[in-house]
Every structure is written in C-alpha cells, then in structure tokens.
Interface confidence: low
C-alpha cells in the first residue's frame, strides 16, 4: 500500500514538472520541483531494493569470456581437424525435438530432460544429447550409411546439488559411424580418434576403459541378477570408479534389494581389469563361457584388441568389467576415457575431472524410430569438452601463459597528432588485403597509449605512421617479439606483414 502511494506521488510530481515545462516556468522553479521528483524516485528505488531482480545467468549455465572463448575455439579446432582427418561429414539438428522423439531413450536419466511449455501446438523437449537426434535423422531420411560429426549444445536438468562441475547447458562433440560393416573395425577407429584427440590436447595422461554391454548382461545373468534389475544394478556398478566396492555393494543390497551373495558374485568379476589376456581368461571362465551373450561380447573384444594393437593404441586401453555406462541405448562395446593425472604444481592435489570422453555401440536406436523397426548399426563417441575446457583453463592460469583473445596481426598507430585520416586509410588498405588490423578509436591518441594497448593485446606487429615517414613514403613496422623496428615502403607493407606473420595470400 505504501509503495502504491509512493508510485502515485511520483506520477503526480512528474505530471507537475511536465506542466511547469509546458508553461515555460522559471528554471529555478522547475529545478526545485525536479529535485523533489528525484527524491521521491530515490525513495521508490530503496523500497525496490528489497525485492530487486538479481542479474545472473540461469542455474547451470554460464557466459564465456573472450579468454574462455579463445580456449574453447582452440579445443574445437583440434577436435574438428581430427574428425575431418577421419573423413567425417558434419550435420546439425534442431535444439528442440518432439517430446515423443526423446521419450523412452534414456532410462533413469529421462527425468533430466527439459520439456518446453506447451504453446498450444507440438509437445517439445530440448535435446538431451546428440545421439538420439542423430538416430532420428537417420530414420527420417532413410539413411543406412554415414560417418558424421556434430558439435552443439545439449540441455540437462541436472540437480546442481548432486552433480558438481556439471552444467545444464553444455557442448557435446560427437562422432558416429552408421552402417553395416565388418565387426569391430569402426569401433576401433572410434577409440583411435578418442586417443588422437586426447593426445593432441595435451591435458595429461589418460586411460580408455572398455567393456561390452553383452558381457555385463551375461555376467549379471550368470551371477543370478533378475532381468528386471539389470539396468539399475548397472548404474551401481558404474560408480566403482568413484567409490569402494563395499559402498557399491551396500547400495545394491541395501537400496536395490539384491541378495548379498549375488552381489559378492558380481564383485568377483567387476573388480577385474586388464588387457587382452583378461578377455582370454574370461572366455575360459566356467560360468561366463556358458553364456551366449557374454561369449559374443568377449569374442568381439578379442578382435577389437587386435585392431587396437595395429592402430598402436593398445597401451592406452584397459578392459574394465566395472564400466557400465548408464545410457539405455548401448548394445555392444562401451568405452570411457578418464584422466589419470593433471599437470599441477608440486604439492597440489591432482584435479579429479572424471570422464573426459565416452561412447559405444548402439545398434537398436535407429530401429526405435523406423516404422518397420529396421535397424542401422551405429557406433560413436562423445568428447567431454566442458571438462576439457576447464582443465585447459586451469592449466593456463597455473602457467600464467597469456591467451590471445583476438587474431589481430597489426595495430595501425600514429606518432603525432592529426594523422587520423592516414590511419583510417592505411587500416582500410590492410583490411582489403585480408590483413587482420586494428586502430584506436581516438582522433589523437598518445603513441604510448597505442603501444601499451598493442603490447597488452599481444598483437605481433605495430605499423607506426609519422609525418616524416609519410613524406618518405615509408611506414615504421615494429615487432612485439624482437622489439626491432624497420622502415617498410608503403607499397611493400602488406607483403612484409604477411611474411612476418606467415599468412598465405587471402582477401575478404
């Protein structure tokens, strides 16, 4: 009520001031009434402070500063070059899909899907990953064969209290091979790509854990897990990289109702990891060797390891029976890359970032969209770029390395006043020649201020125009790295800048 009264007073006082202005009242009188109006508005503002809108990004989202964007673009560049090197095409799909498209594809994670408010038309949801839209794209376009990559944002209603270091809007970088091929060749290439990218990014030692959904399901069957509990027990097993077996067992027994002896049998298997020798050992296992699914999975893994040796990455791969990635659509090989250590300063704890890339085979997903249930075998991987961004950012902060946020090659500066026209002409010439150039937006900037900006921005070169130089038809070109300064003829400037910045001929 008080606020409403105050708003009314402001309105009336405003009208009074406008009236005085229309009547051309004296300046003093108008000023006096304006002062009153401002005081009333200030009172209103204080009152407003109690319920003021807090300016922030929505929970689970963030802005990217130019510095962060520079890091991000470098990471994307490494990833895209690798995807292209392996012959991938690129696609894009809508940020939102029909709700029905995403329904029933993510198991327990479905509750994390963002549904859009119904506007009286289609029921829509924001995409949760890039894989389900890819499967929809294949089915819709009746494609049976494609190798594609897709880099885009996805949306998940993760509970921030439960999932630290995770966002509700984040990038995924996916590479997938769809088509009927001989077993394990595309799967091996996906693992090769994963290793190439993680090595190129130089974020530290990593290990890729490999398992197979069929081995897991076969193992659960021989251990006595009821079919209905396979998926929920899978999610418990998947926690073994973070907590002890004891805790996982407690969850399976206490929370999920599994018999303790069944849990113990699972424990005997899932605590094992190794290489191809473990695969061979399990093929001889009296129980597993009797399970058709498990034998199929183990046979494929044996073949996979042969290809991994040929690709020269077998030392980076570990067969790990506890790997049980949560998504419902995996049907065969599954894999997940984890960072083993993080280059930190002595005495600091290593950064625990968990999974940095993952993927697997999902042969049934496209069939879910096909009216006749026709299947398109698919295998793919996803690079956890958000985690990689934060590792790279932290590493750069620790090293205090300067990150350039622009690609400017040359700053056009002037040594004296009244040279704005000359700077504008020169910068325009450089732009037209495809040179990345900048100038300070002041008529008469001090040379010192220009040079300070040049150094702080990390621009490699500065072209300095002076009155004497103009008369002589030269430009002074100074290098930030060597501090040397040379006179370059105006007509040779573009070529000299290109030479010094190793830029091939290009124009806009």
């Amino acid at each position: 009520a008080d606020r409403a009264a105050l708003e009314e007073l402001v309105r009336l006082q405003g009208a009074h001031v406008r009236g005085l202005k229309e009547q051309k009242a004296s300046a003093e009188q108008i000023e006096e009434e304006v002062t009153k109006l401002l005081k009333l508005k200030a009172q209103l503002g204080q009152d407003e402070g109690k319920q003021k809108f807090v300016l922030k990004t929505p929970k689970g989202t963030r802005d990217y500063s130019p510095r962060q964007m520079a890091v991000r673009e470098k990471v994307f560049d490494v990833i895209i070059r690798c995807f292209k090197r392996h012959g991938a095409e690129v696609i894009d799909t809508p940020v939102f899909e029909l709700k029905e498209t995403l329904t029933g594809k993510y198991g327990e994670d479905s509750k994390l899907i963002y549904d859009l408010k119904d506007q009286g038309g289609e029921l829509l949801s924001l995409r949760y990953d890039l894989t389900v839209p890819f499967a929809r794209y294949l089915a819709m376009n009746k494609l049976t064969n494609i190798k594609r990559y897709h880099i885009a944002k996805v949306y998940r209603r993760d509970n921030p209290a439960m999932t630290r270091g995770r966002y509700r809007e984040f990038y995924q970088c996916d590479f997938d091979i769809a088509g009927q091929f001989d077993p394990m060749i595309p799967d091996a290439e996906c693992l090769k790509i994963m290793c190439e990218i993680l090595s190129s990014l130089q974020i530290g030692n990593f290990l890729v854990k490999v398992n197979d959904r069929r081995i897991l399901d076969g193992m659960f069957a021989v251990c006595g897990v009821p079919d209905s509990k396979f998926r929920t027990i899978c999610s418990s097993v998947d926690k073994l990289d973070k907590v002890s077996w004891e805790e996982v067992k407690n969850e399976m027994v206490g929370e999920k109702g599994l018999a303790p002896e069944v849990a113990d049998r699972i424990g005997d298997y899932v605590q094992q990891h190794g290489g191809v020798s473990l695969v061979e050992q399990l093929l001889q296992d009296p129980k597993l060797s009797q399970n058709k699914q498990a034998v199929e999975g183990l046979g494929d893994l044996k073949l996979l390891f042969e290809y991994l040796i040929l690709f020269g990455i077998d030392d980076k791969i570990s067969f790990d029976l506890s790997l049980a990635r949560g998504l419902d659509y995996y049907t065969g090989v599954i894999y997940e890359a984890v960072l083993l250590q993080m280059p930190t300063q002595a005495g600091e704890e290593p950064l625990g970032v968990g999974s940095i890339a993952a993927g697997g085979r999902y042969d049934g997903l496209v069939g879910m969209f096909d009216p006749k249930g026709r299947k398109v075998p698919c295998v793919g991987l996803s690079i956890g770029v958000e985690r990689i961004f934060s590792i790279v950012e932290q590493r750069l902060e620790a090293s205090e390395e300067k990150v350039r946020t622009t690609e400017t090659q040359v700053l056009v500066a002037s040594a004296q006043k009244k040279l704005l026209e000359e700077r504008l002409k020169l910068v325009s010439e450089l732009w037209d020649a495809g040179i990345k150039a900048e100038l300070l937006y002041k008529k008469n900037p001090k040379l010192l201020n220009q040079l300070q900006y040049w150094e702080e921005a990390g621009i490699p070169l500065v072209a300095i125009i002076g009155e004497q130089e103009l008369r002589d038809g030269v430009i002074k070109l100074r290098s930030v790295a060597s501090r040397e300064e040379v006179d370059v003829r105006r007509e040779d400037l573009v070529e000299e800048i290109r030479r010094r910045t190793n830029q091939p001929l290009s124009t806009c």
């Epitope: 929970k59 630290r164 704890e349 625990g352």
Partner: antibody
C-alpha cells in the same frame, strides 16, 4: 589438512546486514561446495544454503532466499554469506561447512568452520 | 520441507552402557533411502560428522558409534558410552533441498 576459518564475531543493529567469511585451505576449493548452517542460542541447527565454487551453483533454503546471499572468491578460496535486513531472531552462531561430495549422492558435511557469533540488538 | 523428528530429546546412560537415538523423517516422497547423516556437537564447538549415508562411519570416529536404518527410520547407537561422548547428537537428511536437521538429543552420563 582441511581447515575452514571464519571471520570474527559481529554485533549489528536490526535492519542492517552482516557478511561472514569462511577461508578454506588444505584441499582444492573448487572441488567441493560450502554450506552455511546457523544455530540460535540453545537451539538446533538450521541449513541456510550452499554454494559450489567450481561452477557457482547456489542452493538456497527458501526461508532465507530473499535475505541470504552466498558468494565465493576462488582466487582466495573464500566463501561468503551475507544476511540482510537483520532482526533479533537472527542472533545465532553461523557456521560454514564443506559438503562431502561423493558420486553425486546428496551431501553430508565433513568439515566445519569454528563458527561466527552474530548478535542483532538495538 | 522434510521434518526430522529425533527422540528422545535427552538421554542419561551409565558409562559403558548402550545409548540409542532415533530419527524419523516425515518425507514428502515415499522414502529418503539412506541419505541420513549423524553429527556430534560438544558445547562451544562446531558439529562433527560421525556417520554418513545412514551407516558409513566417518574416518577417525571410534567404532563404538554405528548407524542403521533405511526408508524413514534411522538409529544412531553408541555401544559403550564413554565420558567423552557427552554431547548433543543431530541427524540430518540430504534427500531434497532444503537439508534439515533433527532437533537434537542431549546425551549425559547417569
């Protein structure tokens, strides 16, 4: 070893604001959340909210949503809790505590600060 | 909010005897699973985590302390009370925001 050191006792008038700090050491500040819990004289514990410095998430107890602001400065590994429009019933010891984060299970609080007594009196 | 009801409010037990504290959560959902934690608070000190997730003993806590229960009913047991166990004990759930605490149980020596 993990330590949370809080700022000293404060005496405030009704309507004023108070800002309590909590400096963390002995672990990677951005890997864990910091919760704020208060305890009125002779009373039990009341959770006010938490902040996760690694991603600047805050979780708020609706009861304090309009008055409590939780922030964190990662450069100094310090968390802050500011409570505005103080009233006499806000007189309490305010604790910060580290959220024990484990496999995305909900939090227990494994390390606590020594507490900051805030007295609100006219 | 989930209401946590702790009982009894206070408890006097002879040295070496068993002390049992109960905590019941009136949860909106059917169950709070085992997201229940127990703290010990001595006068003038901050609370100290004893047991997390209903039954997991925090490192450095004597094994005379144990926790049990699931669903909505949880128990903290001190198998053989020692003089240094005189304190107020609180349960806390972390099933949904806001986390809430029980009212506390004051344990004294008889």
């Amino acid at each position: 070893q993990v330590q949370l050191v809080q700022s000293g006792a404060e005496v405030k008038k009704p309507g004023a604001s108070v800002k309590v700090s909590c400096k963390a050491s002995g672990y990677t500040f951005t890997d864990y959340c910091i919760g704020w819990i208060r305890q009125a004289p002779g009373q039990g514990l009341e959770w006010m909210g938490d902040i996760c410095p690694g991603d600047t998430y805050t979780n708020d107890n609706e009861k304090f949503k309009d008055r409590a602001t939780m922030t964190a400065d990662t450069s100094t590994s310090t968390a802050y809790m500011e409570l505005s429009s103080l009233r006499s019933e806000d007189t309490a010891v305010y604790y910060c505590a580290r959220g024990e984060e484990q496999l995305g299970l909900r939090n227990a609080m494994d390390y606590w600060g020594q507490g900051t007594l805030v007295t609100v009196s006219s | 909010d989930i209401v946590m009801t702790q009982s009894p409010d206070s408890l006097a037990v002879s040295l070496g005897e068993r002390a049992t504290i109960n905590c019941q959560s009136q949860s909106v959902s059917t169950s709070t699973y085992n997201y229940m934690h127990w703290y010990q608070q001595k006068p003038g000190q901050p609370p100290k985590l004893l047991i997390k997730y209903a039954s997991n003993l925090e490192s450095g806590v004597p094994d005379r302390f144990s926790g049990s229960g699931s669903g909505t009913d949880f128990t903290l047991t001190i198998s053989s009370l020692q003089a240094e166990d005189v304190a107020t004990y609180y349960c806390q759930h972390s099933w949904e925001i806001p986390w809430t605490f029980g009212g506390g149980t004051k344990v004294e020596i008889k």
